[in-house]
């Protein structure tokens, strides 16, 4: 778990100014110390997708990336706890699952991830910009909540190609540019040598591309990995609002568990026994480094170039912490 490490405070830089390299070098030991101290910080992920098969149908998937055991998961929409959120489903590893309309099917996927199929029509139908939140109560970490919504660029009418690699940052472009010039110089010299000696030079194609290939892989995920992490989207109606469900279910205590089937009262061997619907076999999922499980064999994403806020074109694996294979 994280302990409070004293890290020197950096004042907000002036717009457009970068910190001096020397200053950053001095800070590096502190950064490394902080990284060691905070390696156990848990993370929550939320994935929101529209189903291609049915109109106004959403699939919400949530996962907890931490060392603790999950004791309760609460899924809500309309905002997080304390900001007008309305509970859609509560999943307990021992006492089972309870869900409220328009939630259709809530289930455990793994011991630390759940999925919820949501559908509705008219007033109870979710919007494309609806916020869905998942709150994980775990021991010993405590309670952690994360929210997500459908990406604004997910236009179901368009079959977009895989997300292109982003425009290279200036410093990276400079490095690649210099490398390219040097590479071109080497190729040119070899070409001159070949002409001078009147014999064929060794194949240069691999050396022409190899210095840039690893960097390109780091910037853009493969089509295969993207295809395994996305599903097609479908149109949903726009007349939508989170239904006022607070009167439909109690918030005060665990008494509602009494209405669950009695077979859910004992602790099962695995997540499959927790849910009212069976979990697909473990082999039908691909395990991704960041703990995100996705069905294999899906189409490339519908994430076109119109993302407006902070899209990460490098895919879910980018910039994640030490997330072991689950």
């Amino acid at each position: 778990m994280r302990t409070e490490a004293q890290v020197p405070a950096l004042q907000p830089p002036e717009p457009g100014l970068e910190g001096a390299m020397g200053h950053r070098t001095l800070v590096l030991p502190w950064v490394l110390l902080t990284l060691c101290v905070t390696a156990g910080t848990p993370e929550v992920w939320v994935q929101v997708r529209m189903e291609a098969t049915e109109l106004s149908s959403f699939t919400i998937r949530c996962g907890f990336l931490g060392s603790g055991s999950i004791s309760l998961v609460t899924v809500s929409w309309g905002g997080p706890n304390g900001a007008g959120g309305t509970t859609l489903a509560v999943l307990h590893p021992e006492r089972g699952i309870r869900q409220w309309a328009p939630a259709r099917q809530a289930r455990w996927e793994t011991q630390s991830s759940i999925s919820l199929i949501l559908e509705g029509s008219g007033a109870s139908s979710p919007c494309a910009n609806t916020t869905f939140c998942c709150k994980f109560a775990s021991f010993p970490e405590g309670s952690w909540e994360a929210c997500g919504s459908l990406p604004p660029s997910s236009d179901p009418g368009l079959s977009a190609p895989p997300t292109p690699a982003p425009i290279l940052r200036a410093d990276l472009a400079g490095i690649l540019g210099v490398s390219g010039v040097l590479l071109f110089g080497c190729v040119y010299l070899l070409h001159l040598l070949r002409r001078h000696k009147h014999r064929p030079a060794p194949r240069l194609q691999p050396s022409r591309t190899s210095p840039q290939a690893p960097r390109a892989r780091a910037w853009a995920p493969s089509q295969a990995s993207q295809a395994a992490l996305h599903v097609p989207y479908a149109t949903i109606n726009t007349s939508c609002r989170p239904a006022t469900l607070d009167t439909a279910h109690p918030h005060g205590g665990p008494s509602w568990w009494a209405s669950l089937p009695t077979h859910a009262a004992h602790r099962p061997q695995g997540p499959a026994a927790w849910a009212s619907t069976p979990i697909p076999a473990r082999g039908s999922f691909v395990s991704v480094e960041n703990g995100l499980y996705a069905q294999a064999g899906e189409r490339p994403p519908h994430t076109g170039p119109g993302l407006t806020l902070f899209p990460d074109p490098r895919g879910p694996r980018a910039m994640e912490g030490p997330l072991g294979v689950r």
Epitope: L10, R24, A39, P151, P311, M319
Partner: nanobody
């Protein structure tokens, strides 16, 4: 350039709630990760939480002191990030800063490497 403007701070009683907003404008498409930091009087600036988008998936992490009291979420269409703070304590009194982080930023590295900062909004929790 990327401009970040925080709002929603103010005075609140212990145990109360506040929602901070951070509106991003300008070069938003070049950023991938947003975070919140805070700096209490006479203390170092510390990481509160960060949110990262990747396709249809949102990743969120928090500092340990949050302990389920805060929720970080965003509205991509509106270029806005929110920090919902519940069960506030007097020790949560601080200036809260919104930050835009580069895609290769490690959120656990405190305020090191932050590219853009907002001016901050003051949150005062009275006992």
């Amino acid at each position: 350039q990327l401009q970040l403007v925080e709002s929603g701070g103010g005075l609140v009683q212990s145990g109360g709630s506040l929602r901070l907003s951070c509106a991003a404008s300008g070069r938003t498409r070049s950023m991938y990760v947003m975070g919140w930091f805070r700096q209490a009087p006479g203390k170092e600036r510390e990481f509160v939480g960060r949110i990262k988008w990747s396709g249809d998936t949102t990743y969120t992490s928090y500092a340990d002191f949050v302990k389920g009291r805060f929720t970080l979420y965003g509205n991509q269409a509106r270029n806005t990030v929110y920090l919902q703070m519940n069960s506030l304590k007097p020790e949560d009194t601080a200036v809260y800063y919104c930050a835009a982080l580069p895609s290769d930023y490690d959120y656990r590295a405190a305020s090191y490497g932050v590219d853009y900062w907002g001016k901050g909004t003051l949150v005062t929790v009275s006992s």
